[in-house]
Interface confidence: medium
């Protein structure tokens, strides 16, 4: 089963792909932003400042809610998918 925990983080101006990595590996921070201001992609808070927010899970941005959810891996829960269930 997949557990989805909702948190909200601000959209940022990075154009990396959505964060879907299995944590706790951490991505390196991106380079300078704002260089390609024409045709900028919609901001995704799963990138840049909050790219590592979901510890054991996948970051999903729900734009109309201005919300970020952490889709937790099995056995993990909590706001950042940081807690392991003892089942």
């Amino acid at each position: 089963s997949v557990r989805v925990e909702q948190v909200v983080k601000p959209p940022q101006n990075k154009t990396e792909s959505e964060n879907t990595s299995d944590k706790p590996k951490r991505k390196k921070k991106g380079g300078k932003n704002g260089k390609n201001r024409r045709n900028r992609k919609k901001k995704n808070p799963c990138n840049a400042e909050f790219q590592n927010f979901c510890i054991h899970g996948e970051c999903k941005y729900i734009e109309h809610l201005e919300a970020v959810t952490c889709k937790c891996q099995q056995e993990y829960f909590g706001e950042r998918c940081g807690e392991k269930s003892m089942k």
């Epitope: 948190v7 983080k9 601000p10 921070k29 704002g34 400042e49 590592n52 927010f53 706001e79 950042r80």
Partner: antibody
Framework: EIQLQQSGPELVKPGASVKVSCKAS????????MYWVKQSHGKSLEWIGY????????GYSQKFKGKATLTVDKSSSTAYMHLNSLTSEDSAVYYC????????????WGQGTTLTVSS | DIKMTQSPSSMYASLGERVTITCKAS??????LSWFQQKPGKSPKTLIY???RLVDGVPSRFSGSGSGQDYSLTISSLEYEDMGIYYC?????????FGGGTKLEIK
């Protein structure tokens, strides 16, 4: 009750360094990024950077890279800002601020720490 | 860095008066703008986020508007407790940048 309690005023000599603390209470410290802001006397605010307390990952404004170092101690729910090679230009009030999650805005601020650099 | 130009830098207004403060960004900031109020010797307090969303507990006489590069904060009917310095902040792009502030005083 959520609080951000900053360390007291500092008077230091040029060339020295200082560490300002911001102790969080009343919430899950590692779930909210902490931000630092500088306010020089009678002037506007400047964004120094932020830190993700879970990983200890900081992000800095280019202007403050090499000047400020942001760290956290998860065990005491405390964020720190270390400022080095101090000059009179660093004299200011420094604030820590938490960013809320839903909705996301700067919802809690520390009371500010006054730093005076003078010989 | 995105430059935020705030105006006026200071102003006097009478109680009950409608007050408007403006902030212009050097580029489109996609409504990622907050307004803060700061009283002497105190920490800033967020009034508005995402250009027009009122923070819980902030009086409804405060409102924000704007898009693209141009934004404004309006106080519909000035009260004595509203005096202080007001700042805008863009959080569209790193580094976040503040406007220079508007000092609001009572006539």
């Amino acid at each position: 009750e959520i609080q951000l309690q900053q360390s007291g005023p500092e008077l230091v000599k040029p060339g020295a360094s200082v560490k300002v603390s911001c102790k969080a209470s009343g919430y899950a410290f590692t779930n909210y990024n902490m931000y630092w802001v500088k306010q020089s006397h009678g002037k506007s605010l400047e964004w120094i950077g932020y830190i993700d307390p879970y990983y200890g990952d900081p992000g800095y404004s280019q202007k403050f890279k090499g000047k400020a170092t942001l760290t956290v101690d998860k065990s005491s729910s405390t964020a720190y800002m270390h400022l080095n090679s101090l000059t009179s230009e660093d004299s200011a009030v420094y604030y820590c601020a938490r960013r809320g999650n839903f909705p996301y805005y700067f919802d809690y601020w520390g009371q500010g720490t006054t730093l005076t650099v003078s010989s | 860095d995105i430059k935020m130009t705030q105006s006026p830098s200071s102003m006097y207004a009478s109680l009950g008066e409608r007050v408007t403060i403006t902030c212009k960004a050097s580029q489109d900031i996609n409504s990622y703008l907050s307004w803060f109020q700061q009283k002497p010797g105190k920490s800033p307090k967020t009034l508005i986020y995402r250009a027009n969303r009122l923070v819980d507990g902030v009086p409804s006489r405060f409102s924000g508007s704007g898009s693209g590069q141009d934004y404004s904060l309006t106080i519909s009917s000035l009260e004595y407790e509203d005096m202080g310095i007001y700042y805008c902040l863009q959080y569209d792009e790193f580094p976040y940048t503040f406007g220079g502030g508007t000092k609001l005083e009572i006539k």
